[in-house]
């Protein structure tokens, strides 16, 4: 399996009750506006064929996409949670900037691309869905990267 380097986050990032609560509240607010319950972004298909040691790199890719293509464009919605959660997630993204995989990451990019395609295909409702799954993103990052 490809070797991942610098794919680590300190546990303390996920032990801040206030921002954890705000992240979960933001996800819940968005999920209430999500009418498409047939599609799951962060689930079995995303992790398929990705070993445990590669998952932090996988989640870094998902985090970066979520920030750039979803949260920044939707930053005026779901206040006041959005204005607190986005900088927190951006800091995590910055801390993972040196997280790379040495070797072939095509299988990971394929899974991430499917997630991206799903969000794009659903349009704005795809973006809402991605925000509604921020709790899953948070917990997946936590388990994959600490």
């Amino acid at each position: 399996a490809p070797i991942s380097s610098h794919c680590r986050l300190d546990k303390s990032n996920f032990q801040q009750p206030y921002i954890t609560n705000r992240t979960f509240m933001l996800a819940k607010e968005a999920s209430l506006a999500d009418n498409n319950t047939d599609v799951r972004l962060i689930g079995e298909k995303l992790f398929h064929g990705v070993s445990m040691s590669e998952r932090c790199y996988l989640m870094k890719q998902v985090l970066n996409f979520t920030l750039e293509e979803v949260l920044f464009p939707q930053s005026d919605r779901f206040q006041p949670y959005m204005q607190e959660v986005v900088p927190f997630l951006a800091r995590l993204s910055n801390r993972l900037s040196t997280c790379h995989i040495e070797g072939d990451d095509l299988h990971i990019q394929r899974n991430v691309q499917k997630l991206k395609d799903t969000v794009k295909k659903l349009g704005e409702s795809g973006e809402i869905k991605a925000i509604g799954e921020l709790d899953l993103l948070f917990m997946s990052l936590r388990n994959a990267c600490i």
Partner: antibody, heavy 119, light 108 residues
Framework: EVQLVQSGAEVKKPGASVKVSCQAS????????IHWVRQTPGQGFEWMGW????????RYAQKFQGWVTMTRDMSNTTAYMELPGLRDDDTAVYYC????????????WGQGTLVTVSS | QSVLTQPPSVSVAPGKTATITCGGN??????VHWYQQRPGQAPVLVIY???DRPSGIPERFSGSRSGNTATLTISRVEAGDEADFYC???????????FGGGTKLTVL
């Protein structure tokens, strides 16, 4: 077919130790966390912790930290849960369960191992 | 003492609809899973993430959420549905899954 097959029932005296095994088949062992959950008539279900088969890393519930030990053997795709210093109230059915992400969506469970602690 | 509250028992006639609830404080932002446990058997996941159904679980099983209460609904109940049902959720603050005390479903 995904299967988790656990070791048989155990009867132990207070203060003794028990080691329960959980053999996985039908999927890639290293791709799923193995959790241990126990069930008692009084307390219901109680999460004990998980082992990451790929790395051997563990996460334990606070109650079991420094007490339980969870390990795995990749060569025979088996996870183990060892609990020393047994007390009467550790009498329970102990389950292993697999989960993809490391939190709480258990898509497959072992059949359970009854551990009875009695003098 | 369970953090998630479920009614101890629910009774329903065959062919009717059974509703099992699960509630808890500060629970509204967390996702809920439901497990079915028949006597002497291991639990089986029947609903995850509030309303998703794993493959192989009949469409008669559905889940929903409203505020601090999650609901498992079983329509056209059959005798084989008789079991204990448990809700669970992940608490990111204590970093562990929590379980309800269970509801015994009796098919009359």
């Amino acid at each position: 077919e995904v299967q988790l097959v656990q070791s048989g029932a155990e009867v132990k005296k207070p203060g003794a130790s028990v080691k329960v095994s959980c053999q996985a088949s039908g999927y890639t062992f290293s791709d799923y966390y193995i959790h241990w959950v126990r069930q008692t008539p009084g307390q219901g279900f109680e999460w004990m912790g998980w082992v990451n088969p790929d790395t051997g890393g563990t996460r334990y519930a606070q109650k079991f930290q420094g007490w339980v030990t969870m390990t795995r053997d990749m060569s025979n795709t088996t996870a183990y849960m060892e609990l020393p210093g047994l007390r009467d109230d550790d009498t329970a059915v102990y389950y292993c369960a697999r989960d993809l992400t490391g939190y709480d969506q258990y898509t497959a469970w072992g059949q359970g191992t009854l551990v009875t602690v009695s003098s | 003492q369970s953090v998630l509250t479920q009614p101890p028992s629910v009774s329903v006639a065959p062919g009717k609809t059974a509703t099992i609830t699960c509630g808890g404080n500060n629970f509204r932002n967390k996702r809920v899973h439901w497990y079915q446990q028949r006597p002497g058997q291991a639990p089986v996941l029947v609903i995850y993430y509030d309303s998703d159904r794993p493959s192989g679980i009949p469409e008669r099983f559905s889940g929903s959420r409203s505020g601090n209460t999650a609901t498992l609904t079983i329509s056209r109940v059959e005798a084989g549905d008789e079991a204990d049902f448990y809700c669970s959720t992940f608490d990111p603050f204590t970093d562990r899954p929590l379980f309800g005390g269970g509801t015994k479903l009796t098919v009359l």
